[in-house]
Interface confidence: low
């Protein structure tokens, strides 16, 4: 999936299986990513688990779990708030669109999380105070905290190179980046560009991610995924000058 | 160098109206161990910082004064001055305790927010 880190780095990651997205003293978010097509290096998020840790007089430990075709508006224990403590309402789940869009407010840690199902896959967005982001017990053992450190270099796909290549040669795929033998070859570059431009008029990294996804999968739902990801940035990012990213830094994670 | 953050966390863990860790309790040692851990985490960026080196020596002195072992539990991390779980004196304040921005505004203007997102393939 495409990852925008807490430090505004933008990466396309081929991480497969279960990976920690956030892991601090208050919250743990794990995603499970699966290949979008057989033989493809590109992966998308098929499962999301969020653990809100027991916190003082505010909330009991709560676990939220979403999977493909199952976006519940409740924690796994059936509740919609933080439990029985005095400040239980400082953690709340709100269903915005049934089965498609859920918002979790964790006021006790100043955090808002948006989870969506777009097409078959899940998207995740969070707004969190720096103090909470950095509240980790052991920096050394939490080296794979994706939102903070980014993806390991060997798990990154250079989708801008893919984009440049595709621009020059139609829908020919970069095998090294993301071979997708079963993707519909009939999806031309021009169509991908048109579809993405429709939803994402600014040619930023969200637009480029959209084009990459369409060429890789032939699934137009990924246009909406990029569109909603940008909408969530507009709602959640505190710096309105940084809504659109144009350069992807591919430096070492950390 | 984030030594001032370590100092303030230790201060808030060992002082204040609910005093979770008075000098003669195991909690005080736990708070000291947390303080030591905090200084170790920030060590790389604090070389030559006077406040850092005095904190490190101060911790060693306090550890030996109070017979604290180096290994053992650390105090539970807290956000700002939020009290420890189960502190009954603070129960009536729970709506504010459980509202990060309200408790933050007591200390500084507004928290710095960050964003992370994951989408697509």
């Amino acid at each position: 999936p495409h990852l925008r880190t807490f430090t505004d780095r933008f990466q396309t990651c081929k991480v497969q299986g279960a990976w920690p997205l956030i892991d601090n003293n208050y919250l743990n978010v794990q995603v499970t990513n699966t290949p979008v097509l057989p033989g493809s290096a590109a992966t998308a998020t098929s499962k999301l688990t969020i653990i809100f840790k027991n916190f003082q007089e505010c909330v009991d430990q709560k676990v939220y779990q979403a999977e493909m075709d199952e976006l519940p508006a409740a924690f796994v224990d059936g509740s919609k708030n933080g439990g029985d403590k005095h400040g239980a309402n400082s953690l709340k789940i709100t269903e915005k669109v049934s089965g498609q869009h859920v918002e979790i407010q964790a006021k006790y840690i100043g955090t808002t999380i948006v989870v969506r199902q777009v097409g078959r896959y899940l998207t995740f967005a969070v707004r969190m105070p720096e103090e909470v982001v950095n509240a980790v017990e052991d920096w050394d053992s939490q080296g794979l905290y994706l939102c903070l450190r980014g993806c390991p270099l060997n798990q990154q796909i250079d989708f801008q190179a893919f984009h440049t290549n595709a621009e020059g040669t139609g829908a020919r795929r970069l095998a090294a980046a993301s071979p997708a033998p079963t993707a519909p070859e009939t999806f031309p570059y021009e169509t991908a560009v048109a579809k993405c431009k429709e939803k994402l008029p600014v040619e930023d990294l969200y637009y480029q991610a959209c084009v990459f996804d369409l060429l890789t999968t032939g699934d137009v739902n990924f246009t909406l995924a990029a569109y909603y990801a940008l909408e969530d940035v507009k709602m959640l990012h505190s710096n309105k000058d940084k809504l659109h990213l144009y350069e992807r830094t591919r430096d070492l994670p950390g | 160098c984030k030594i001032l953050k370590c100092n303030s966390e230790f201060w808030s863990a060992t002082s204040g109206s609910h005093a979770p860790a008075s000098d003669d309790t195991p909690e005080f040692c736990a708070a000291l161990r947390s303080y030591a851990l905090c200084t170790r985490r920030t060590a790389r960026t604090c070389r030559g910082d006077l406040a850092y080196h005095s904190a490190v020596h101060g911790i060693e002195d306090l550890m030996s004064q109070h017979n604290c072992s180096k290994d053992g539990p650390t105090s539970q991390p807290r956000l700002r001055t939020l009290p420890p779980a189960g502190d009954s004196q603070e129960r009536s304040d729970s709506p504010e305790i459980c509202h990060y921005e309200k408790s933050f505004h007591k200390h500084s203007a507004t928290p710095n927010y960050t964003h992370c997102g994951l989408f697509g393939d």
């Epitope: 299986g17 279960a18 990976w19 794990q30 027991n54 009991d60 224990d77 053992s141 | -």
Partner: antibody, heavy 120, light 109 residues
């Protein structure tokens, strides 16, 4: 003290069912999952599945799907594991364990185990 | 789904260090932060020794430590003691099933 206390040993015939109970105390029963793990004589540990006592959500090991049923009774803080169509290879000690922080994570408290013998 | 692979047995003298490996796939070990280790004495229930690869529950001596490299997680017991003689199991999660390793018998010579 957090404790899980299991029911006593059982002897069953092949084809029968067995229901093992696990009574929790010392913590809020609905705030943790319960996993079931079995261990055949002289063998290793074998995960059977998980249940959320609050919602009844379950996640069973693929090889036991259709034969295992996990339930809970929140009024008595008790979890149950029922295994049907028993065969001799189901002879094992069955453990319940509290799950530390979510369905698939670490098991921090274990019951004492219940020996189930399947023999004709 | 195959279990995680552990050596059948390891041994060491008191005071020595021993390391038990637990090898799986990228999804069961390599990409997972949720690897835990359990100690089991004969006739007893297992006991949690490490969780989330490296973390020690309270009450577990600090001579027990965990690490991970690639698709292999490891448990190290430094300063081996007589009471450490037991079976040790690793556990992780892959796909939809929780997996245990086959177990390693640690013998204190």
């Amino acid at each position: 003290e957090v404790q899980l206390v299991q029911s006593g040993a059982e002897v069953k015939k092949p084809g029968a069912s067995v229901k093992v109970s696990c009574k929790a105390s010392g913590y809020t029963f609905t705030s943790h999952g319960i996993s079931w793990v079995r261990q055949a004589p002289g063998q290793g540990l074998d995960w059977m599945g998980w249940i959320s006592p609050y919602s009844g959500n379950t996640n069973y090991a693929q090889k036991l799907q259709g034969r295992v049923t996990m339930t809970t009774d929140t009024s008595t803080s008790t979890a149950y594991m029922e295994l049907s169509s028993l065969r001799s290879e189901d002879t094992a000690v069955y453990y319940c364990a509290r799950v530390g922080s979510g369905p698939y994570y670490y098991m921090d408290v274990w019951g004492q185990g219940t020996l189930v013998t399947v023999s004709s | 789904q195959s279990a995680l692979t552990q050596p059948r047995s390891v041994s060491g003298s008191p005071g020595q260090s021993v390391t038990i490996s637990c090898t799986g796939t990228s999804s069961s070990v390599g990409d997972s932060i949720y690897v835990s280790w359990y100690q089991q004495h004969p006739g007893k229930a297992p006991k949690l020794m490490l969780y989330d690869v490296t973390k020690r529950p309270s009450g577990v001596p600090d001579r027990f430590s965990g690490s991970k490299s690639g698709n292999t997680a490891s448990l190290t017991i430094s300063g081996l003691q007589a009471e450490d003689e037991a079976d040790y199991y690793c556990k992780s999660y892959a796909g939809t099933d929780t997996l245990f390793g086959g177990g390693t018998k640690v013998t204190v010579l």
